[in-house]
């Protein structure tokens, strides 16, 4: 995303070659003031030394126009045109293309597999604790507690289908009512959006890429949070989801269907089951207060078992516990009865890595968490690199136009709805909204898809995952069919309601604006992305959980003032931006508050102090790895390498820390762009050059 046109021979910084250049009056008052306050001296020039001439023409074109950081970057084609290639070159190009496609599919495959393993890792680390959240009896009476349990459990197990299936089994066994289950499902919907936000963090190396990727990922979060903010109170007041879904379930005479088709899993399962296999029933059993399950391992050891039913004599406390009076007897002291007992005979062990290690679940979980995050990160980097090399020139133009262009007038409004359908269809194919949205994230980052287009695709993904749940519900056994179908329909109608709230009218597309705002903040202060993740997905839910356990009075006592302050701040912010004259002078800005309460700068300084010592060694490692990678891939020397390091170096340069001399392949334009603070050319340079 070059801030101004580049010329091969244009000197990156003309001011260095026009010494003593000053200007009495800046041409671009906004940006130049902001970015170069220190140089704003009004002293006349005394010395004018001519240095070798460099073309600065390109640097003063339209000086007042600043690129919108949300505009898609132009992916320039540096290669030779197809028509200019000879036969050998064309064949080589075709093979390169095929090779890249194979590599792309390969990395995409491992990317999806690592997401699956990541989910397993989270379940091993936090699954049992997540299961215990469900066994809390207050869920029945407190929808807010249900909501945060849904969020926390889904975040801990990294799978909304796991938390939903626990809810289904609890409803089926009457441990939970459908009414109490609905907030949990809403929470699960929020929790599942953490995955693509984690994936977006992997693109932190490039500011502009990160801005787009993070905003593209968090648009899902904001949609879910906002939907819950509106629909949970509506549901508590009217129970519309419960009533509507009950009417649907009762009006149909469902028969058990076929199993929901496993589409993507067919390809990924053979690989992921070699890594680890989990016994998902354990979490459900813990949720249903099964004491024996607490000591069971989630790691599956026996994959082939034979379950035999046998009649067994067992003692019972009294005759009332007998299966039937005729099947009851005494040995003179104890009462005995005959019961059908199923016993499992282990036949064959599973074939995964951890089957013979007998490590505790936490250890296996941590190992897998580290490995899957590394693989996820590596695959993502490689996908972005390959896509970057493929999506250039004509290809990029075609793809970007296809994805981001609207239908011709008057059908332009239909484009978004088609995108919703595409998102739903794709999610249905991959059988996971996390996989689809996570695959979408790097595409948003590199600028193939706009956030405006990613938004309906994400909404469609939310619908797609519920259709999968409905199919799975229809395939469930008779005893759970009704409850699982009703819960799947609740999930479906919740997402439909959310779409109706936050999509049809462009003005109501708040999630896009909020995500862009967060994207801008996170691009400037990258630590804020992790901060956001921790606060929204862990701290807030855990706080609400803790307060809910303390009881309604405590929850209301703490919650009401907090909500009041938030509303007050939002109203004040709205008035400040729309009609500040209504407010007293003191309230027209936030300066009346301490700096740390209205700016992230002081916090940034504190965090930089703590993370500083780790940055340079990390960057050296990053740079070495990147160079090696460039050598292996045969990238040109100008490849965008170690962007995070360039940012760091620029920051140190500004503070007067000597950094290595710029090399021929250190593209300043790119590093400026990476900083996310696209600057207009320095006014002083412009005037002197003119």
């Amino acid at each position: 995303m070059a801030p101004w046109p580049e010329l091969g021979d244009a000197q990156p910084n003309p001011s260095k070659y026009l010494e003593g250049a000053t200007s009495q009056q800046p041409i671009t008052p906004d940006k130049s003031k902001e970015t170069n306050k220190t140089d704003n001296t009004e002293v006349p020039v005394t010395k004018f030394e001519l240095l070798p001439t460099y073309s600065t023409a390109t640097l003063i074109e339209e000086p007042t126009e600043v690129d919108d950081p949300w505009n898609l970057p132009t992916l320039q084609d540096s290669g030779i045109k197809w028509s200019e290639r000879d036969a050998k070159g064309k064949i080589l190009c075709v093979f390169q293309g095929i090779g890249r496609l194979i590599l792309l599919l390969g990395f995409l495959y491992f990317f999806v597999c690592s997401l699956d393993v990541l989910s397993s890792a989270f379940q091993l680390v936090g699954g049992k604790m997540a299961g215990q959240f469900f066994s809390n009896s207050s869920i029945m009476s407190n929808p807010l507690l249900g909501l945060v349990i849904g969020v926390l459990v889904t975040v801990f197990v990294q799978s909304s289908s796991t938390s939903t299936s626990i809810v289904v089994s609890m409803v089926a066994s009457s441990l939970l009512t459908v009414r109490a289950a609905i907030p949990i499902i809403m929470g699960a919907n929020i929790g599942t959006s953490i995955t693509n936000t984690i994936v977006a963090l992997m693109q932190v190396g490039d500011r502009s890429e990160f801005r787009r990727a993070f905003a593209g990922a968090t648009v899902h979060d904001f949609f879910n949070w906002l939907s819950v903010l509106v629909l949970l109170p509506v549901e508590v007041a009217t129970h519309y989801l419960e009533v509507v879904t009950q009417l649907i379930v009762e009006s149909f005479h469902f028969k058990n269907g076929e199993d929901a088709p496993d589409l993507l899993k067919v390809i990924t399962k053979p690989f992921t089951k070699l890594i680890v296999q989990l016994d998902k029933k354990v979490i459900s059993q813990i949720a249903m207060n099964d004491e024996t399950a607490k000591n069971k391992s989630l790691v599956k050891i026996w994959c082939k078992t034979f379950t035999n039913m046998t009649q067994m004599n067992v003692t019972v406390p009294s005759m009332a516990n007998c299966t039937s009076p005729s099947l009851c007897w005494t040995d003179g002291i104890q009462i005995w009865t005959m019961k059908n007992v199923t016993y499992k005979e282990n036949i064959a062990k599973c074939q995964h890595i951890f089957v013979n290690f007998h490590l505790p679940d936490l250890a296996v979980g941590i190992i897998l968490l580290i490995i899957s995050l590394l693989v996820l990160c590596g695959c993502l980097i490689m996908i972005v690199k390959i896509l970057g090399s493929v999506l250039k020139g004509q290809v990029a133009t075609v793809i970007k136009k296809t994805i981001n262009t609207d239908f011709p007038f008057p059908f332009a409004w239909l484009t978004g709805y088609l995108a919703i359908l595409v998102g739903a269809g794709m999610t249905f194919i991959v059988q996971s909204s996390s996989v689809f949205t996570s695959a979408l994230t790097p595409l948003i980052g590199i600028g193939v898809i706009t956030i405006e287009r990613a938004y309906p695709l994400t909404l469609g993904s939310n619908i797609g995952t519920t259709t999968t749940a409905i199919l799975a519900a229809l395939a469930s056994p008779g005893n759970t069919l009704r409850s699982s179908l009703q819960i799947a329909l609740c999930h479906f109608f919740f997402n439909i309601s959310g779409i109706l709230l936050w999509y049809p009218i462009p003005f109501t597309r708040l999630p896009i604006r909020m995500a862009k705002g967060l994207g801008n903040i996170s691009a400037k202060y990258r630590w804020f992305a992790i901060f956001y993740l921790i606060i929204f997905f862990f701290l807030i839910p855990l706080t609400v959980f803790g307060l809910s356990l303390a009881g309604w009075p405590v929850l209301v006592g703490v919650g009401v003032p907090v909500v009041f302050i938030i509303i007050l701040v939002l109203c004040l912010r709205l008035l400040q931006s729309r009609c500040p004259r209504v407010l007293p002078k003191k309230l027209q800005n936030w300066n009346f508050l301490p700096l740390c309460m209205h700016s992230l700068k002081p916090w940034d300084a504190v965090i930089s102090k703590f993370t500083g010592p780790f940055q340079m060694p990390c960057c050296c490692c990053c740079r070495v790895c990147c160079r090696v990678c460039c050598l292996l891939c045969g990238c040109p020397k100008c490849c965008r390498c170690s962007k995070c390091c360039q940012d760091l170096e620029e920051g140190q340069e500004a503070q007067g820390v000597p950094v290595k001399a710029p090399e021929t392949f250190d593209n300043i334009t790119i590093s400026r762009e990476a900083q996310g603070e696209v600057r207009a050319p320095d006014s002083k340079t412009e005037c002197t050059a003119l």
């Epitope: 009076p325 005729s326 007897w329 005494t330 040995d331 003179g332 002291i333």
Partner: antibody, heavy 119, light 107 residues
Framework: QVQLVQSGAEVKKPGASVKVSCKTS????????MHWVRQAPGQGLEWIGA????????AYNQKFKGRVTMTADTSTSTVYMELSSLRSEDTAVYYC????????????WGQGTLVTVSS | DIQLTQSPSFLSASVGDRVTITCKAS??????VAWYQQKPGKAPKLLIY???TRHSGVPSRFSGSGSGTEFTLTISSLQPEDFATYYC?????????FGQGTKLEIK
């Protein structure tokens, strides 16, 4: 092989107590219940109660409750049955019998102890 | 308490005869019934348990049948050593109870 050897015959006065022993061998003493059954002269069999030597748990026929006490000594693999407040109608042959595991059939019996109650 | 009534109380038969003794329970006892043989001056000996299962070492001429409230002990071919008193017992519930006995004599 399983053997149950009971103590010898006893003659008691009304109101007195009698303690009959039953020494077992040939099996794991703590795994099976031990029953006590009596048979009055020329009459049928009557169940008095049972003891589980493993835990010392007992169950008595309501008819004898308050008068009967059953104990087990695991060190000698012996069970005891004490009947107090003897009456003339308590004159009978008292048998100890091993209960089959898991139900109330009695597979091995002692030779019996004749208790005579007379003034 | 569950009452067990045996019939007949006395039975005369010859060697080689097929003999059937009946035991009726006052309420459903399932199959929790055992049969014993007792010879004068001796302790009872277990023949059948669970209404139909022969105890180890018991000759095959002894068989049991029935469930619920009616049970039978059948001796297919009487042998000289079979002349004794036979008792049925229920262990469906406490207290364990026995029938009054059926005395089998030589005709």
């Amino acid at each position: 092989q399983v053997q149950l050897v009971q103590s010898g015959a006893e003659v008691k006065k009304p109101g007195a107590s009698v303690k009959v022993s039953c020494k077992t061998s040939g099996y794991t003493f703590t795994t099976n219940n031990m029953h006590w059954v009596r048979q009055a002269p020329g009459q049928g069999l009557e169940w008095i109660g049972a003891i589980y030597p493993g835990s010392g748990a007992t169950a008595y026929n309501q008819k004898f409750k308050g008068r009967v006490t059953m104990t087990a000594d695991t060190s000698t693999s012996t069970v005891y049955m004490e009947l107090s407040s003897l009456r003339s109608e308590d004159t009978a042959v008292y048998y100890c019998a091993r209960g089959m595991y898991g139900h109330g059939a009695m597979d091995y019996w002692g030779q019996g102890t004749l208790v005579t109650v007379s003034s | 308490d569950i009452q067990l009534t045996q019939s007949p109380s006395f039975l005369s038969a010859s060697v080689g005869d097929r003999v059937t003794i009946t035991c009726k329970a006052s309420q459903d006892v399932g199959t929790a019934v055992a049969w014993y043989q007792q010879k004068p001056g001796k302790a009872p000996k277990l023949l059948i348990y669970w209404a139909t299962t022969r105890h180890s070492g018991v000759p095959s001429r002894f068989s049991g049948s029935g469930s619920g409230t009616e049970f039978t002990l059948t001796i297919s071919s009487l042998q000289p050593e079979d002349f004794a008193t036979y008792y049925c017992q229920q262990y469906s519930s406490n207290p364990l109870t026995f029938g009054q006995g059926t005395k089998l004599e030589i005709k």
